[in-house]
Interface confidence: medium
């Protein structure tokens, strides 16, 4: 089974190092999820030729995947800690339905897909503890998520492969931007 962050001794800087701070724990958690995504992308790329498709060709999809923008305050220029944290948490909550969709999309990496999903839930909890403005965080409607999930699962095989590839890539990109932003907090 995949090892959760903090359980892998080789990542610890020194034998008698201090316990991880909440920021370090969040940082490590995101990197753990990125490793999981990397493994899932490998299986997707081996299974279909989606990874060779140009970004432009794949952009013409109807998925409304969360994405960072200038107004979210997460970039080096115009950085705003509170606004950015709300965006990261909201984005992760929006990704949850897509991570649920991924659960029966993998054969050899089924455990890895589950680990990514569960780790994301834990990450959201970590970040919610850090956030001051929890009221500004909008949680997606369960009914909306359920109908979206049904719609995605009804797609043909080719579209499902493309959807899987897009979710993994977008989630990777969102986490990479989040990682950079969180290091400024």
């Amino acid at each position: 089974a995949p090892v959760l962050p903090g359980e892998d001794s080789k990542d610890v800087a020194a034998p008698h190092s201090q316990p991880l701070t909440s920021s370090e724990r969040i940082d490590k958690h995101i990197r753990y999820i990125l490793d999981g995504i990397s493994a899932l992308r490998k299986e997707t790329c081996n299974r279909s030729n989606m990874c060779e498709s140009s970004k432009e060709a794949l952009a013409e999809n109807n998925l409304n995947l969360p994405k960072m923008a200038e107004k979210d305050g997460c970039f080096q220029s115009g950085f705003n800690e509170d606004t950015c944290l709300v965006k990261i948490i909201t984005g992760l909550l929006e990704f949850e339905v897509y991570l649920e969709y991924l659960q029966n999309r993998f054969e050899s990496s089924e455990e890895q897909a589950r680990a990514v999903q569960m780790s994301t839930k834990v990450l959201i909890q970590f970040l919610q503890k850090k956030a001051k403005n929890l009221d500004a965080i909008t949680t997606p409607e369960p009914t909306t998520n359920a109908s979206l999930l049904t719609k995605l699962q009804a797609q043909n095989q080719w579209l499902q492969d493309m959807t899987t590839h897009l979710i993994l890539r977008s989630f990777k990109e969102f986490l990479q931007s989040s990682l950079r932003a969180l290091r400024q907090m």
Epitope: D35, S38, M68, S77, Q176, S177, R183
Partner: antibody, heavy 120, light 107 residues
Framework: EVQLVQSGGGLIQPGGSLRLSCAAS????????MIWVRQAPGKGLEWVSD????????YYADSVKGRFTMSRDISKNTVYLQMNSLRAEDTGVYYC?????????????WGRGTLVTVSS | DIVMTQSPSTLSASVGDRVTITCRAS??????LAWYQQKPGRAPKVLIY???TLESGVPSRFSGSGSGTDFTLTISSLQPEDFATYYC?????????FGQGTKLEIK
């Protein structure tokens, strides 16, 4: 063939401005993470700035923040480094490069470098 | 900022020798480390990424190891074309930083 062709270096006086260009071929900059690295004469490598394709956000080293601007022109498949208020310590070879598409970032493609000399 | 310290700064060796270059990070960086080779007047070239993964096309005599703060680059049997300067680079967090370099010269 994947390559980066650089231009725009030269001799410039302190306080002056210069724009470096880096034209990519064999891949599209709109879906790649680009970076500038410099090397002072006889010295090691130093990260200058990078541009993350995902949202076009840029990050800069403290030594150049507020003076250098990295940008891109997707239609020309080219990235730029606009350098203002140049100082003697900015002298060196500037490399345009690409981060590999792997979250364990590493530079997999480098330009040949362009020499910038800041001197009066 | 994460400081990367390489040792030795200069290394003299002969063709056929086994050589090891070390790189130490000022804080834990897990496996977020790459090694580059640079020859005079040329751009650097990646050899190893993710601390121990060999870049495609790089000879298998090059290997990398380590995790956390201590890393090594090993060349199992030096070839004439391996005499160059080697740099480590961390990609754990910005500012991305490089080691000061290790110059590998002919003894």
């Amino acid at each position: 063939e994947v390559q980066l062709v650089q231009s725009g270096g030269g001799l410039i006086q302190p306080g002056g401005s210069l724009r470096l260009s880096c034209a990519a071929s064999g891949f599209t900059i709109s879906s790649n993470y680009m970076i500038w690295v410099r090397q002072a004469p006889g010295k090691g490598l130093e990260w200058v700035s990078d541009l993350y394709y995902y949202a076009g956000d840029t990050y800069y080293a403290d030594s150049v923040k507020g003076r250098f601007t990295m940008s891109r022109d997707i239609s020309k498949n080219t990235v730029y480094l606009q350098m203002n208020s140049l100082r003697a310590e900015d002298t060196g070879v500037y490399y345009c490069a690409r981060w590999a598409d792997d979250h364990y970032y590493y530079i997999d493609v480098w330009g040949r470098g362009t020499l910038v000399t800041v001197s009066s | 900022d994460i400081v990367m310290t390489q040792s030795p700064s200069t290394l003299s060796a002969s063709v056929g020798d086994r050589v090891t270059i070390t790189c130490r990070a000022s804080q834990g960086i897990s496996s977020w480390l790459a090694w580059y080779q640079q020859k005079p007047g040329r751009a650097p070239k990646v050899l190893i990424y993710k601390a121990s993964t060999l870049e495609s096309g790089v000879p298998s005599r090059f290997s990398g190891s380590g995790s956390g703060t201590d890393f090594t680059l090993t060349i199992s049997s030096l070839q004439p074309e391996d005499f160059a300067t080697y740099y480590c680079q961390q990609s754990y967090s910005t500012p991305w930083t490089f080691g000061q370099g290790t110059k590998l010269e002919i003894k």
